[in-house]
């Protein structure tokens, strides 16, 4: 990990950008813990695997999650 | 637009401290990580510092770790570098700059925002 | 700790030709971690790219980046008369966290 650090988040910028579900590879969000006393939102996009920190607060990134749970609902049995 | 200004350069002599500030305008500073990067007369740059968008992360380059203290007032729009025990090889121009947008400790988006930068002397 | 060397030191070239500037480090890289910067006379490094390859936002396409692992590479494919300028190489990752090479001087022939 590049930083030695006590608290151990992860994003050191958050982006408020919409981001296309199609280009997304994979989604995750870290609750907030002992380690670090904040959600995060980290999304892994198609395109080189770039990750992004995207901001919990975004009116666009909480669209993105409605979108993502959304289409996660269709594809469960 | 937008636009990092630094300010609180100036002469100062060897153990003496100096706090530098620098004020955001154009974007909402309180989503970026930010930096300070200094370069020594006629040198490189070097990086001195980092702060994560909530002040969460923090990290120092080697140089100026015990010496330097980093930190932000997002409700002032304002990053600080808290200068310490000055020496003669912390005599430079030091810049602040932004982390870009969504960086994490994954992926580097690079410092796409940087000051004019402002001069500290350190000089008896 | 990683450090980085650039090369060449200088790199005195004609407007039109192609420029490759060299960025070298003493251990492996990942590409998410490496940015090249330019830097004129007076003024403040602006960013050209990041992950390696990725231009940054404004960025004309003449410049390019690439490589992996220990070397990396920036290509200027014809150089305009506002491209002579100092260019760095830039790695995230190690202690210290950011370190920057000491940089190639691109000047007019």
């Known amino acids: 990990v590049p930083l030695s650090r006590t608290v151990r988040c992860t994003c050191i910028s958050i982006s408020n950008q919409p981001v296309n579900p199609r280009s997304l590879e994979k989604l995750e969000i870290i609750p907030a813990s002992q380690f670090c006393p904040r959600v995060e939102i980290i999304a892994t996009m198609k395109k080189k695997g770039e990750k992004r920190c995207l901001n919990p607060e975004s009116k666009a990134i909480k669209n993105l999650l409605k979108a993502v749970s959304k289409e996660r609902s269709k594809r469960s049995p | 637009q937008v636009q990092l200004v630094e300010s609180g350069g100036g002469v100062v002599q060897p153990g003496r401290s100096l706090r530098l500030s620098c004020t955001a305008s154009g974007f909402t500073f309180s989503d970026y990580g930010m930096h300070w990067v200094r370069q020594a007369p006629g040198k490189g740059l070097e990086w001195v510092a980092v702060?994560?968008?909530?002040?969460?992360?923090?990290g120092y380059a080697d140089s100026v770790k015990g010496r330097f203290t980093i930190s932000r007032d997002n409700s002032k729009n304002t990053l600080y570098l808290q200068m310490n025990s000055l020496r003669a090889e912390d005599t430079a121009v030091y810049y602040c700059?932004?982390?870009?947008?969504?960086?994490?400790?994954?992926?580097?988006?690079?410092?796409?925002?940087w000051g004019q930068g402002t001069t500290v002397t350190v000089s008896s | 700790e990683i450090v980085l060397t650039q090369s060449p030191g200088t790199l005195s070239l004609s407007p039109g030709e192609r420029a490759t500037l060299s960025c070298r480090a003493s251990?492996?890289?990942?590409?998410?971690?490496l940015a090249w910067y330019q830097q004129k006379p007076g003024q403040a490094p602006r960013l050209l790219i990041y992950?390696?390859?990725s231009r940054a936002t404004g960025i004309p396409d003449r410049f390019s980046g690439s490589g992996s692992g220990t070397d990396f590479t920036l290509t200027i494919s014809r150089l305009e008369p506002e491209d002579f300028a100092v260019y760095y190489c830039?790695?995230?990752?190690?202690?210290?966290?950011?370190?920057f090479g000491p940089g190639t001087k691109v000047d007019i022939k």
């Open positions: 830039q790695q995230y990752g190690s202690s210290p966290i950011f370190t």
């Open positions: 702060i994560g968008y909530g002040g969460l992360i923090k």
């Open positions: 251990q492996s890289v990942s590409s998410s971690y």
């Open positions: 992950g390696a390859s």
């Open positions: 700059a932004r982390e870009g947008a969504g960086s994490s400790i994954y992926y580097y988006y690079g410092m796409d925002v």
